[in-house]
Structure formats: C-alpha cells, structure tokens
C-alpha cells in the first residue's frame, strides 16, 4: 500500500493543501485513496511511513511575523484531528520572494478509515511547479 | 533492495551530482547498482522510496538571482528523462557563504533498467563533508 | 520493527538530543527500544531507514559564526561512534530568532545492539512544540 500525490493550486481559502493524481503520481491500489483532493485515507490498520514536501516562496516584509509552518495532520474515525509533524521556516528577505523547501516524514500507526492531510499557514505562498510540493505514504 | 551512496566532489562541469560507494554506504545486492558514479539503476520493477539530501553553501551576492534547486530525476528505458521531485532554497546572505540542507523523498514506480539521479543548479556549491550529501532508495 | 519518538527539553548540557515515548509516538515491539531517553537501540541485524527532524530557532548575531548542524550518529557494539548523516543551516537574521527545520534520512545496515542518536550544535535552540522535532526508524 503506497501513494504519492502532486500539489494542486486551489482557489479555496482553506489552509489544507489540495492534491491530485497527476504527473508521476503513485496509487498502488484501492486500500489507499485520495479523498476530496485533500486527504489520503487508508483502509487497513498498520504502521505507515507518511511524508510531505512543501516548497514555498515568501518575503519577510510582505508576510506576517510568524514563520511559514507546514503541518502533517491525522483524522481518525471518531477522534479529533491531531498534529503528527510540523516544520517551520522563517520568511526570506529576498525580493519579490525567496523559495524554501520543507520536508516532513515519520512512522505512525493508522486505524482503518484514518485520513492524513497537510496544513500550511499560507497556501498562496506554496510553489506548484513540477516536483516542488508532494505528499505520500507507504505501509510497512 | 536498498542503496545509500555518498557524494563525491567532481571536476566535471555537469549539473548531475557524482556519488561513490565509500564511507558508511549501503548496496544491498546486485539488483541495484551505481552506474558511472552518477545514477542508481534498478533491475526489478516495483515501488521504491527514493531520497536525496544535498547540503550546499552559497551567498546571495556571489550567486545568480535564481535559487539553488536540487532535482531528483528519472530515466526509464526508451523514455525521456523526467523530474520526480525538486526542492529550492534561496541563497543566504551569510559571508563567505551560508550552508543550507535540502531533503527530497517520495514513492515512485520504477521499471526494470530505470535510473535515478540528482541534478543541482550549481555543483560547486555542494558540501561533501561527512554525511552532508547522500542519495539512496529502498524497494517496498 | 519501527519507532518514532518525540523530542524532550533537557536541562543537561550534552549536545545529544533527548527523546520520549509521548504524544503520538510509535514503538512497534521490544526489538527496538529507547535507551536513557537518548538513543534508539535495535536487537536485530538488518537494513533500516533512519530519520530525524529537528526544528530550531536561532539568530545570527546571538549565535556562533558556525551554522546549526544536526548529526545522526551510530554506536555499534565494540565499535566507536560514527556520523551517518549531517545537515546544516545558517542562522537566521530574524529577531529574536528565526525558526528553521532540518530533515535527515537514509538507509543503513545496523548490527544487533547498535544504537543511533542525534547530536546538535546547540540544544538550547531546538524547538519542542508539538511535532517540530522527532526521531525514528523502520526495518526494511
């Protein structure tokens, strides 16, 4: 069971990143699915290595004081959402904006029907060029 | 099937990074090989988690306007090269140069004879000290 | 065999990061253990994908000239410590400090009783907020 999906620009104002099965994507079988273009949902319980990479372009003057943060989050059936992993990068002083890449990854136990998704502080700063921003998992 | 190879400084002017089986490297068996010191080639079709880490040292004034970009690329038999993953980091203002590290990783389907390699915008900026820059894969 | 542990602030002056089985941690079975809150020790020989993520907050003026470096280190029985992976990030000019995240990961052969741990140049700069700093491995 494995998946690798590709970022998709979205007009939605949500902080949850959108993904698509496009380009050189992976969706090994129907035991993992991309739901609503926003979350990877697994049907089997077990240990999964889950990862995300986010490339963004921001400028210190044009952004809030707070850093750019990418969060890998989990929603299990009948449970509250929770944060699995986070990474933070201070905005660049480069003009008009400076690109930076964040990589997240870790091993987590997922229940049947559990979904994982990626949240960012400012989706408008995310880079969607080939290979820059992606999201995936693999069952151990 | 797994491999982990170590960066090697090169006098070549190519943007493709060079690697060696040295230091604490891994080459599990002959189903994955390091070819010409530049690409990992697999003999078996399947899903692979492929990763690369690149540490570089650059300075904004001494570099081009464009950021430092590391790309994980694929060459399948009878197919064109394609980009699997990219990461970008804006150059540092630190003098003489500021070090930064990039990590790339994802799950991809590889065909028999497929090769993966790493491209960077400026190989002269790559750091080759112990553990700084490496490249590998594992078959799921 | 898999583990994922969560960073723990420590009053110790050591450069070795401290970890805990807390939050959304993983410890698949007793073939991998967290020892002294500082190292993951495996009982079975084999190939492991080992990873660490470190988020830190630093300022160029308040830090040494040298970059922030995170190192993944190995101690095998009857052998001395060695460095598997390193990542470096130059300190930010943001005030009071600028957050940055480092991700390390690679495939390595471990012997029975081998331990892996994470070293940083300045543990006081490490961010221990939910999901920011973690460490883990999985057996292939």
């Amino acid at each position: 069971i494995a998946a690798h999906v590709i970022s998709e620009a979205s007009s939605k104002t949500t902080s949850v990143l959108q993904w698509a099965e496009k380009g050189y994507y992976t969706m090994s079988n129907n035991l993992v699915t991309l739901e609503n273009g926003k979350q990877l949902t697994v049907k089997r319980q077990g240990l999964y290595y889950i990862y995300a990479q986010v490339t963004f372009c921001s400028n210190r003057e044009a952004s809030s004081q707070a850093p750019f943060i990418a969060s890998l989050c989990l929603k299990s059936p009948g449970r509250f959402e929770r944060i699995l992993l986070r990474a933070a990068n201070t905005h660049s002083s480069a003009k008009p904006c400076g690109q930076q890449s964040i990589h997240l990854g870790g091993v987590f136990e997922l229940q049947p029907g559990a979904s994982v998704f990626v949240n960012v502080t400012d989706p408008s700063q995310v880079s969607h060029g080939t290979g820059f921003t992606s999201f995936g998992l693999l069952k151990l | 099937i797994a491999a982990h190879v170590i960066s090697e400084a090169s006098s070549k002017t190519t943007s493709v990074l060079q690697w060696a089986e040295k230091g604490y490297y891994t080459m599990s068996n002959n189903l994955v090989t390091l070819e010409n010191g530049k690409q990992l080639t697999v003999k078996r079709q399947g899903l692979y988690y492929i990763y690369a880490q690149v540490t570089f040292c650059s300075n904004r004034e001494a570099s081009s306007q464009a950021p430092f970009i590391a790309s994980l690329c694929l060459k399948s038999p009878g197919r064109f090269e394609r980009i699997l993953l990219r990461a970008a980091n804006t150059h540092s203002s630190a003098k003489p140069c500021g070090q930064q590290s990039i990590h790339l990783g994802g799950v991809f389907e590889l065909q028999p004879g497929a090769s993966v390699f790493v491209n960077v915008t400026d190989p002269s900026q790559v750091s080759h000290g112990t553990g700084f820059t490496s490249f590998g894969l594992l078959k799921l | 065999i898999a583990a994922h542990v969560i960073s723990e602030a420590s009053s110790k002056t050591t450069s070795v990061l401290q970890w805990a089985e807390k939050g959304y941690y993983t410890m698949s079975n007793n073939l991998v253990t967290l020892e002294n809150g500082k190292q993951l020790t495996v009982k079975r020989q084999g190939l492991y994908y080992i990873y660490a993520q470190v988020t830190f907050c630093s300022n160029r003026e308040a830090s040494s000239q040298a970059p922030f470096i995170a190192s993944l280190c190995l101690k095998s029985p009857g052998r001395f410590e060695r460095i598997l992976l390193r990542a470096a990030n130059t300190h930010s000019s943001a005030k009071p400090c600028g957050q940055q995240s480092i991700h390390l990961g690679g495939v390595f052969e471990l012997q029975p009783g081998a331990s892996v741990f994470v070293n940083v140049t300045d543990p006081s700069q490490v961010s221990h907020g939910t999901g920011f700093t973690s460490f883990g491995l999985l057996k292939l």
């Epitope: - | 604490y24 080759h128 112990t130 | 001395f80 060695r82 390193r86």
Partner: nanobody, 116 residues
C-alpha cells in the same frame, strides 16, 4: 594499504598538556571521518573524539569534553588531538582510527602517562 602512525605521547604531570598527531596514508584522507580512541591499562577501548572529513563537526566523550580538542589538516594528511588539563585517569594508549563499514583501521598507538 591504509596506514596510521601516531606520535606525541609521553609522560606529563597532572594539569599538563600534550598534542598527539596521526599521519595517515594509503587512502584519500580528506574524504573520511577520523576518530581518536584510547585504552587504559587493564580496561577496554574507549571512544574519545571524532571529526568529520571537512573538520566542521567535532564530537567528544563526556569524560574529555572541554579539555581535549580534535582537529585535522587535510593538506598534510594529519589528525591531531590537543589534550589539556590532563588527569591521571587519562593515562592510556591513544589510537587514531579510520572507521570502515565492517571493521576499522587502527594505528599502533602512542602511550600517554599522566603522573606526578
């Protein structure tokens, strides 16, 4: 063939200093991490310090931290260990070593005796 030759050991009083050197040959010295280890009389081997190939990162055992400094000169293929504030418990044969995957390469060692 990997060769490592240590020098600089000797008898020194507590609180004194010594600088050990290790001349390396038979491999591309500047591409490898290097290590100092020691063996006290009647005891097992103890890791003392490591240095990365570029010299940028150094690591020390708690017992020597703040007193010993590891360094290297890649142009001279030489590894150093500056030992200050020496104590009786630092008495040992000091070896420089090049880590390998399956086994490690060792020098012959140099004896350091700390005694009044």
């Amino acid at each position: 063939e990997v060769q490592l030759l240590e020098s600089g050991g000797g008898l020194v009083q507590p609180g004194g200093s010594l600088r050990l050197s290790c001349a390396a040959s038979g491999f591309t010295f500047g591409e490898y991490e290097m290590v100092w280890v020691r063996q006290a009389p009647g005891k097992g081997l103890e890791w003392v310090s490591s240095i990365t190939s570029d010299g940028l990162s150094t690591y020390y055992a708690d017992s020597v931290k703040g007193r010993f400094t590891i360094s290297r000169d890649n142009s001279k293929n030489t590894l150093y260990l500056q030992m200050n504030s020496l104590r009786a418990e630092d008495t040992a044969v000091y070896y420089c070593a090049k880590p390998g995957i399956r086994f490690d390469y060792w020098g012959q060692g140099t004896l350091v005796t700390v005694s009044s």
